[in-house]
């Protein structure tokens, strides 16, 4: 065969579905690799061809359109499962071509098995509500172009095993499920299936999605550092470890770069040529407040590092802060005999 | 390890209610369902239903809807089952069950209470 | 509602004997299966759950398999200890229910 424009494997797309489910999957090609789009395509005479390689073998094979019940269809650029089957696991390839064009991708599918809390391998989206902050909500994800308008299908939310109902703050609402004021015990995984009927038959599409409560932007304030502050001298001597802790705590704010620096006389300590060491700790609270520290580390401080400015600075989506911690040479402890006693007078 | 403790045995009359507690002792006990089933004399087990303390949903048999209330106090680690309208054919021993958490597909239910004998007789 | 139906209604096996209860239910329930032993006066004592993982604590003489609607609880050689009702419980579906028992008598 004539030469193919290869796009590999895409495993950007690792696909993942449930078992005896229906799943959609549209060539990628027309969403991440070409300028333009099926029906462009089809226009133009091209062709969409789809094969497959199965799980642990490398050769390439037809997909089976010829199945009961059209178990395996194609339709424009979408290939269909009703249902899928475990062994359905493979490498799957769309390839677009005439007499003068090719084109070709593959990408992963995984078919996986869920218990009957709905516990499975698949990677799960994370929604992240606001704490306290009212009414927020979540949607049932990915079941467009499953089944017409026309149908009214029947949806049932989970909360893990259970299904939702008489919930203190949590209400099914069809395809949203309502949360009138999220807590810290709304934290985890949200299943909704989605039951609807197509040419006689029944099918179930289960989507689960792990839901975590986060601070409010309502109670969000700028950086905040407890450390270096006023309270905290940082005495030594020259040939001792110098050490500064700079900690800083940021509210939870969504999509915000939170970041801590220090300066050494207003340079970053990568621009001088100190000795100086930075070691970095986050830890995170149940609403995913932060909380950084860097520690700057001088194994052997000389009397010019202890006369520098050393400043921790801090910056996120609501503003910059800076804190210079208070550095001094520690007065060596005066020797009785000779200063004391000269001090007093003797002779 | 967990204990669940019941409140004693109740005769009650035909038409009026009962209220049983389930004590959770030496362990968590919001995180996992308490779940109610009851034995009538020399039958089976039935399961009536349950309640999840820590977000407060609660589930009930479809035979029991209606008359069973199902509630828990988590500041007291205490599960209550209320049935009321009585009848002779409630009269059995009733036992909560702790069942296992959000995320357990091991559904079964692995700590028992001792039971609580309710005779209903006129 | 899932109707498990539980064969024999009763047992009745010697000391040292192999025990076969059986379990079936109206339609599949996977593996969402436990088996319960129930003596006079006590309550129920999970035994098996997963259809064939063994609670903590149980002896390695009581063994469940199965999966779907056909499920076996074996009690490989009957100790006194033993003899007592048994109950199959699918926690597939809303409503979970239970089997109405096997009774094992010492024969």
């Known amino acids: 065969s004539e030469r193919c424009d290869d796009w590999g494997l895409d495993t950007m797309r690792q696909i993942q579905v449930f078992e005896d489910e229906p799943a959609r999957i549209k060539c990628p090609l027309f969403e991440h690799f070409l300028k333009f789009n099926y029906s462009t395509a089809h226009s133009a005479g091209l062709t969409l061809i789809w094969y497959w390689t199965r799980q642990d073998r490398d050769l390439e094979e037809p997909i089976n359109f010829r199945l009961p019940e059209n178990r395996i269809s194609k339709e424009k650029d979408v290939l269909w499962f009703r249902p899928t089957l475990l062994n359905d696991t493979g490498n799957y390839t769309c390839m677009l071509r005439n007499t003068t064009y090719c084109s070709k991708v593959a990408f992963p599918l995984e078919v996986v098995q869920k218990d009957s809390c709905f516990n499975s391998p698949m990677k799960l989206p994370v929604h992240k509500l606001y704490i306290e902050y009212g009414i927020q909500r979540i949607t049932c994800p990915n079941v467009d172009g499953y089944f017409p308008s026309s149908v009214k299908p029947t949806i049932t939310w989970y909360m893990g095993c259970y299904k939702i109902q008489n919930f203190n703050n949590v209400i099914p609402e069809g395809m949203n499920l309502s949360f009138l004021i999220a807590l810290i015990s709304n934290n985890g995984n949200y299943t909704c299936v989605v039951t609807y009927p197509e040419n006689g038959r029944t099918f179930h599409l289960t989507r689960t999605l792990t839901v975590k409560v986060v601070g409010s932007p309502k109670n969000a304030v700028p950086p905040v550092i407890h450390s270096p502050n006023d309270h905290v001298v940082y005495e030594k001597e020259p040939g001792e470890e110098l050490l500064i802790p700079c900690t800083v705590y940021f509210s939870f704010l969504m999509d915000s770069r939170n970041e801590v620096w220090w300066t050494i006389d207003g340079k970053k300590p990568d621009d001088i040529t100190i000795d100086v060491t930075i070691n970095e700790s986050i830890s995170h609270s149940r609403t995913e407040d932060e909380t950084r520290t860097q520690i700057l580390s001088i194994k052997k401080v000389t009397s010019e590092d202890l006369k520098r400015s050393y400043v921790c600075h801090a910056r996120s989506a609501k503003g910059e802060v800076a804190k210079a911690a208070k550095v001094k040479q520690k007065v060596p402890a005066p020797r009785y005999t000779v200063e004391l006693a000269c001090g007093f007078g003797a002779t | 390890q967990v204990q669940l403790v019941q409140s004693g045995a109740e005769v009650k009359k035909p038409g009026s209610s009962v209220k049983v507690s389930c004590k959770a002792s030496?362990?968590?006990?919001?995180?996992?369902?308490i779940q109610w089933v009851r034995q009538a004399p020399g039958q089976g087990l039935e399961w009536m239903g349950y309640?999840?303390?820590?977000?407060?949903?609660?589930d009930y048999a479809q035979k029991f809807q209606g008359r069973v209330t199902i509630t828990a106090d988590e500041s007291t680690s205490t599960a209550y089952m209320e049935l009321s309208s009585l009848r002779s054919e409630d009269t059995a021993v009733y036992y909560c069950?702790?069942?296992?958490?959000?995320?357990?597909?091991?559904?079964?239910?692995?700590?028992w209470g001792q039971g609580t004998l309710v005779t209903v007789s006129s | 509602e899932i109707v498990m139906t539980q064969s024999p209604a009763t047992l009745s096996v010697s000391p040292g004997e192999r025990a076969t209860l059986s379990c079936r239910a109206s339609?599949?329930?996977?593996?969402?299966l436990a088996w319960y032993q129930q003596k006079p006066g006590q309550a129920p004592r999970l035994l098996i759950y997963?259809?064939?993982t063994r609670a903590t604590g149980i002896p390695a003489r009581f063994s469940g398999s199965g999966s779907g609607t056909e499920f076996t609880l074996t009690i490989s050689s009957l100790q006194s200890e033993d003899f007592a009702v048994y109950y199959c419980?699918?926690?597939?579906?809303?409503?979970?229910?239970f089997g109405q028992g096997t009774k094992v008598e010492i024969k």
């Open positions: 030496g362990g968590q006990f919001s995180e996992y369902a």
């Open positions: 419980q699918q926690y597939n579906n809303w409503p979970w229910t």
């Open positions: 997963g259809a064939s």
């Open positions: 309640i999840i303390p820590t977000v407060g949903g609660f």
């Open positions: 339609q599949s329930v996977s593996s969402n």
């Open positions: 069950a702790r069942g296992q958490t959000l995320y357990d597909s091991g559904r079964q239910f692995d700590i």
